[in-house]
Interface confidence: low
C-alpha cells in the first residue's frame, strides 16, 4: 500500500482540532499582481511582504505596491505602506535584507523619468520604521551589503559607476567609473572589473581587475586581459585571455589577488565557459564546458590551493543556452553532492558522490519502486533526480531537491526510477541517510518543506486546480496525515517557512478568484501543538553517517574521519525546538588510498583506487607554473584530498621543488602591479 496508508502508521491524536486552533488566515486587500516575501533576521518572526500590481494604461503602465509586515511568523500582517509614503517599489531589485541579524532592509523605489537619481527606503530596526533617501545615481543592481559590516553598501549605477556608502545608504560616493562587475570579498574588500574602450561587452577579455581594501581611498590593479572573475571559499578566480588566440584560462589567487597561479585546467574557447559549482575553504568544484554546443562538460576538483585539478566527472550536464545544471550540494550530510550527466544516447542520468567528488555512482533504486520503461533490465535500475534542468524544461517538477544542515541525513527530491530521467509525472522520494538509500514518499509532484529540524515534513500537492489540503509527516515521510486548512480552496502559489528549517510555522500562499476580483491570501499553520512535548534524550538514537558495512573497522570513514550523530527516532513525536544543535562525535580514520586524489599528470582508472600516470605524460618532467615561477613536481601520483583528516596508514610521498625559472601567465607579474590612491 502507499506510504501513509499502512496499519502500522500511528495517527497523531486529535491533530485536526490542534491545527485548526493554530491556523491563521490573512486576506490581503490587493488585486493579484505579484507578491514577494522576505524574512528579516533569524528567529525574529518578522516577515515583509511586498505586493505589486501593474495597470497597463494606453501610454504607460501605472504601478501600485503595498508593503505588509508580520512579527509573528506570518500569522498576522499589518499594512505599513504609509511608512514608505505609498511609493511604488521596484520588484526587480527585491527587498535587500541585511546579513545576520542586522535588522537592515533596503527597498528601491520607482522614480519618474526625469529625476536626477533613484530613491531608496532604509530601515535598521527590522522594518518598524523607514527613512527615505534620494540617491545621486540611478541604481542598476540591488544594494549589496558587505558580509562583515552591514553599514557598508555598494551598488552599480546605470552609467556603470561603482558607488559605495559607509553609513547604510545615507550618503553615497562614486569610487570608480566604467565598472562592469563588483563583488565584496573578505575584510570589506571590493573586487571589480573595469573597461577602457567603451563598454563592458566590447572589452570582454580586455577588462582590468581592480581591488580596493579601504572602500575606495586606494586601488590596486590585480589583473589584466580579464574576461570574468569569481569568488569561492578562500579562492579568487579570474578567466584570462591568452596572448596568441581567443582562448582563455583560469588563474587562481588565495591572497586576494596579490599573487596568481595558472590553474591546471583546460583552456576554453569563445563559445565555452568555466563555472564554479561549489567552493569552500578547502577546495573547489569547477565545471569546464566542452567545445561545441554539447550541453555538457567536465567537473574537476581542486587541491587545497585551487591550482592542481583532478578530473571528477565526465559528460556533466550544463546547458549553455539556459545555463542550467543540476549540481546540488546535499547539505544534510558532509561530502555528498548530486548532479546529472548526459549519456552517449542523450538521456539524462543522476549521479551522486559521497566523498566530495572522488567517486560518482548512480543512486540506489528505492525498495518500494519498480523500474520504468527507460530501464534495459527491469530488476536493475537507479533513481534519477529532477533538479534545475527538468524545471527549466517545464517538466512537472515544482521544486528542486531539498536538504537542510540541521535535518541530518534527510534529502527530499522529485525523481523517476529507470536507466535515465523520465518525462513522466515524477514522484517524490526521500533519503534519510544522505542519499545512500531512497524511498518513494509521495505519489506525484508536490511542494515540500522541512520544519523543526526534520521533526515535521510538510507537503502540498502540485495541481492546476485550487487546493485546500496540506499533508504532514512526523516520521521522516513514512506516514502522512492530511489536514484541510480552509473550506474554500485557493489557487496555490507557494509554501514559505523560515530559512534554516527550525521553525514550526508554515505559510501557504495563494489567491482566491471570484467573478470580479482575485486577492492574495495566506494561511499560516503552527505545528507546535502537534509536537506537544520537548524531545528528551530517550527520543534520540546514535547514527553512524556514511555507514555501508558495519563489519568493517573503517566503516563510515569519509575524507579521513567518521561522524556519529544523535538523531531523532522516527517514532518520537516531539519538538527538537528552535535551539536544537546537531550533536555529532567525529573520530579520525587511518589513511588509505581513498584519502588521496590523483596528482597532476595521473588519473584513476575506473573501479581502481590506484593512480596511474597519464600515457601522454609518461617519462616527462612534471612542471607547472606557480606564483609566476616554474615548479618541478616529484610525486608517486597521489595528493591528499582537501579537508581530509586521516592520520597514519598509507602515506604516498609528494614533493614540489622551485626550478628558479620564470614562467608567465597573462597577468602582470606581482612586482609590476600598480597601485594608486584617490
Amino acid at each position: 500500500s502507499a506510504p501513509g496508508e499502512d496499519e502500522e502508521c500511528g495517527r497523531v491524536r486529535d491533530f485536526v482540532a490542534k491545527l485548526a486552533n493554530n491556523t491563521h488566515q490573512h486576506v490581503f486587500d490587493d488585486l493579484r499582481g505579484s507578491v514577494s516575501l522576505s524574512w528579516v533576521g533569524d528567529s525574529t518572526g518578522v516577515i515583509l511582504v511586498l505586493t505589486t500590481f501593474h495597470v497597463p494604461l494606453v501610454i504607460m503602465t501605472f504601478g501600485q505596491s503595498k508593503l505588509y509586515r508580520s512579527e509573528d511568523y506570518g500569522k498576522n500582517f499589518k499594512d505599513i505602506t504609509d511608512l514608505i509614503n505609498n511609493t511604488f517599489i521596484r520588484t526587480e531589485f527585491g527587498m535587500a535584507i541585511g546579513p545576520e541579524n542586522s535588522g537592515k532592509v533596503v527597498l528601491t523605489a520607482e522614480v519618474s523619468g526625469g529625476s536626477r537619481g533613484g530613491r531608496i527606503f532604509r530601515s535598521s530596526d527590522f522594518a518598524k520604521n523607514f527613512v527615505q533617501t534620494d540617491l545621486p545615481f540611478h541604481p542598476l543592481t540591488q544594494m549589496m551589503y558587505s558580509p562583515q559590516n552591514s553599514d557598508y553598501l555598494l551598488a552599480l549605477s546605470t552609467e556603470n559607476g561603482l558607488w559605495v556608502s559607509k553609513n547604510f545608504g545615507g550618503k553615497w560616493e562614486e569610487i570608480h567609473k566604467a565598472v562592469c562587475l563588483a563583488k565584496w570579498g573578505s575584510d570589506n574588500t571590493i573586487f571589480f572589473t573595469t573597461y577602457a574602450n567603451g563598454s563592458c561587452k566590447a572589452d570582454l577579455g580586455a577588462l582590468e581587475l581592480w581591488r580596493t581594501s579601504d572602500l575606495g581611498k586606494s586601488f590596486k590593479t590585480i589583473g589584466v586581459k580579464i574576461y570574468s572573475f569569481g569568488l569561492g571559499g578562500r579562492f579568487l578566480f579570474a578567466s584570462v585571455m591568452a596572448d596568441k588566440d581567443t582562448t582563455r584560462r583560469i588563474h587562481v589567487s588565495t591572497d586576494q589577488g596579490d599573487t596568481w597561479s595558472m590553474a591546471q585546467l583546460p583552456s576554453v574557447g569563445q563559445e565555452q565557459f568555466y563555472s564554479i559549482l561549489a567552493a569552500n575553504d578547502d577546495m573547489v568544484f569547477m565545471h569546464v564546458d566542452e567545445p561545441g554546443d554539447t550541453g555538457f562538460g567536465t567537473i574537476f576538483t581542486s587541491d587545497d590551493r585551487g591550482i592542481v585539478y583532478s578530473k571528477s566527472l565526465d559528460r556533466h550536464l550544463y546547458t549553455t543556452t539556459g545555463g542550467e545544471t543540476d549540481f546540488t550540494n546535499v547539505t544534510s550530510l558532509r561530502g555528498v553532492y548530486i548532479t546529472s550527466v548526459l549519456s552517449e544516447d542523450n538521456s539524462i542520468q543522476t549521479m551522486i558522490t559521497f566523498d566530495q567528488g572522488g567517486r560518482w555512482t548512480h543512486l540506489r533504486k528505492p525498495e518500494n519502486s519498480e523500474c520504468d520503461a527507460t530501464a534495459k533490465n527491469k530488476n536493475e535500475c537507479s533513481l534519477h533526480i529532477h533538479a534545475s534542468y527538468s524545471i527549466s524544461q517545464k517538466l512537472n517538477v515544482p521544486m528542486a531537491p531539498l536538504s537542510e544542515p540541521n535535518a541530518v541525513g534527510i534529502v527530499i527530491a522529485h525523481g523517476s526510477v529507470g536507466d535515465a530521467i523520465s518525462v513522466m509525472v515524477p514522484d517524490v522520494y526521500i533519503s534519510d541517510d544522505g542519499g545512500y538509500s531512497w524511498t518513494k514518499m509521495l505519489e506525484g509532484p508536490h511542494y515540500y518543506t522541512i520544519l523543526d529540524s526534520g521533526g515535521i515534513i510538510v507537503a502540498i500537492e502540485h495541481s492546476s486546480r485550487p487546493i485546500n489540503v496540506i499533508k504532514f509527516s512526523t516520521d521522516e515521510g513514512q506516514c502522512w496525515q492530511t489536514y484541510t486548512f480552509t473550506r474554500d480552496p485557493i489557487y496555490f502559489t507557494g509554501l514559505a517557512s523560515e530559512p534554516g528549517a527550525r521553525s514550526m510555522n508554515i505559510s501557504i500562499w495563494g489567491f482566491t478568484e471570484s467573478f470580479l476580483t482575485s486577492q492574495w491570501v495566506s494561511y499560516t499553520i503552527d505545528f507546535k501543538d502537534i509536537l506537544e512535548r520537548n524531545c528528551e534524550e530517550k527520543d534520540y538514537t546514535i547514527w553512524l553517517a556514511h555507514s555501508t558495512d558495519p563489519e568493517d573497522y573503517e566503516d563510515g570513514c569519509i575524507l579521513g574521519y567518521k561522524e556519529q550523530f544523535l538523531r531523532l527516532r522516527k517514532s518520537s513525536v516531539c519538538q527538537n525546538g528552535r535551539d536544537y544543535v546537531v550533536t555529532k562525535q567525529p573520530s579520525i580514520c587511518l589513511c588509505s588510498l581513498e584519502d588521496f586524489l590523483c596528482d597532476f599528470g595521473y588519473y584513476r582508472p575506473e573501479n581502481d583506487s590506484k593512480c596511474v600516470e597519464q600515457p601522454e605524460l609518461k617519462g616527462h618532467d612534471l612542471e607547472f607554473c606557480l606564483y609566476g615561477r616554474e615548479e618541478h613536481l616529484t610525486t608517486n601520483g597521489y595528493r591528499k584530498i582537501p579537508g581530509d583528516k586521516c592520520q597514519g596508514g598509507v602515506n604516498p610521498v609528494r614533493e614540489v621543488k622551485d626550478l628558479k625559472k620564470k614562467c608567465t601567465s597573462n597577468f602582470l607579474s606581482p612586482e609590476k602591479q600598480n597601485s594608486k590612491s584617490n
Epitope: D372, V423, E443
Partner: antibody, heavy 117, light 108 residues
Framework: EVQLVESGGGLVQPGGSLRLSCAAS????????MSWVRQAPGKGLEWVAT????????YYPDILKGRFTISRDNAKNSLYLQMNSGRAEDTAVYYC??????????WGQGTLVTVSS | DIQMTQSPSSLSASVGDRVTITCRVS??????LAWYQQKPGKSPKLLVY???NLADGVPSRFSGSGSGTDYTLTISSLQPEDFATYYC??????????FGQGTKLEIK
C-alpha cells in the same frame, strides 16, 4: 507473465455511453502508469488517455477531454475507460497498455467499440 | 503539440534486405521515442524505447538510432515475420504523446 485483458466493447448508439475495463495480472499493478490507445479500422494508433500509478494524475488529448474518463482500482488490478456522448469517429479497437515511462511496454489484445445507429 | 512525421508510409522489401524507417519530430525530444511493431489483427508490440534500447525479447537485427529531432528504426536483415506496420511515438514533455502515422512494410 504480464497480461492485460480488455472487455466491455460492443455496439453503442451515437450519444450513448460505454465503460471499458482492463484486467491486469502478472505484475505489481499499483506502481505502473496505464494508458488507453485506440485504432480506427484501417487507421493508425491514437493515444486516448493515461493515468498515474496511484490514480492521482490523468491525461487526455484535447479532442477527447470532457467526454472520456480514465480511472483505476488498484485493489482490483483494474483499469477503466468511461466513454460518453459516443460519436461515429470513436469506432475503433481500444487497447489498454502498461505505461511505466518512456514507452508502452505491454498491450492487451484490444476490444472493439462500434458507434452506430 | 509535437508533430511526428514518419516515412515512408509504405515500403516493399525482400527477405534479407536492410530496411530503414525514419521518424522526424517537430522539436527536440531528447531521445524520448519508442518504436512499435503491429501485425494485422494483433496488438502492437514494443520494439525499442528511449530511441536506442531494445525491449526484452526483441531480436538483435532491430536497432534504433537518432537524437534531437531525427530518429531511425533499422532492420539489418529482413525476416519473413518482420512484415508488419511500424509506429514511432514520442514521450517528451507533457501530453499528447503522439504516434507517427505508421509505415507498412510489405513483401516485394
Amino acid at each position: 507473465e504480464v497480461q492485460l485483458v480488455e472487455s466491455g466493447g460492443g455496439l453503442v448508439q451515437p450519444g450513448g455511453s460505454l465503460r471499458l475495463s482492463c484486467a491486469a495480472s502478472g505484475f505489481t499493478f499499483n506502481i505502473y502508469g496505464m494508458s488507453w490507445v485506440r485504432q480506427a479500422p484501417g487507421k493508425g494508433l491514437e493515444w486516448v488517455a493515461t493515468i498515474s500509478s496511484g490514480g492521482i494524475y490523468t491525461y487526455y488529448p484535447d479532442i477527447l477531454k470532457g467526454r472520456f474518463t480514465i480511472s483505476r482500482d488498484n485493489a482490483k488490478n483494474s483499469l477503466y475507460l468511461q466513454m460518453n456522448s459516443g460519436r461515429a469517429e470513436d469506432t475503433a479497437v481500444y487497447y489498454c497498455a502498461r505505461h511505466p515511462g518512456g514507452a508502452m511496454d505491454y498491450w492487451g489484445q484490444g476490444t472493439l467499440v462500434t458507434v452506430s445507429s | 503539440d509535437i508533430q511526428m512525421t514518419q516515412s515512408p508510409s509504405s515500403l516493399s522489401a525482400s527477405v534479407g534486405d536492410r530496411v530503414t524507417i525514419t521518424c522526424r519530430v517537430s522539436e527536440n525530444i531528447y531521445s524520448n521515442l519508442a518504436w512499435y511493431q503491429q501485425k494485422p489483427g494483433k496488438s502492437p508490440k514494443l520494439l525499442v524505447y528511449a530511441a536506442t534500447n531494445l525491449a526484452d525479447g526483441v531480436p538483435s537485427r532491430f536497432s534504433g538510432s537518432g537524437s534531437g529531432t531525427d530518429y531511425t528504426l533499422t532492420i539489418s536483415s529482413l525476416q519473413p515475420e518482420d512484415f508488419a506496420t511500424y509506429y514511432c511515438q514520442h514521450f517528451w514533455g507533457t501530453p499528447p504523446w503522439t504516434f507517427g502515422q505508421g509505415t507498412k512494410l510489405e513483401i516485394k
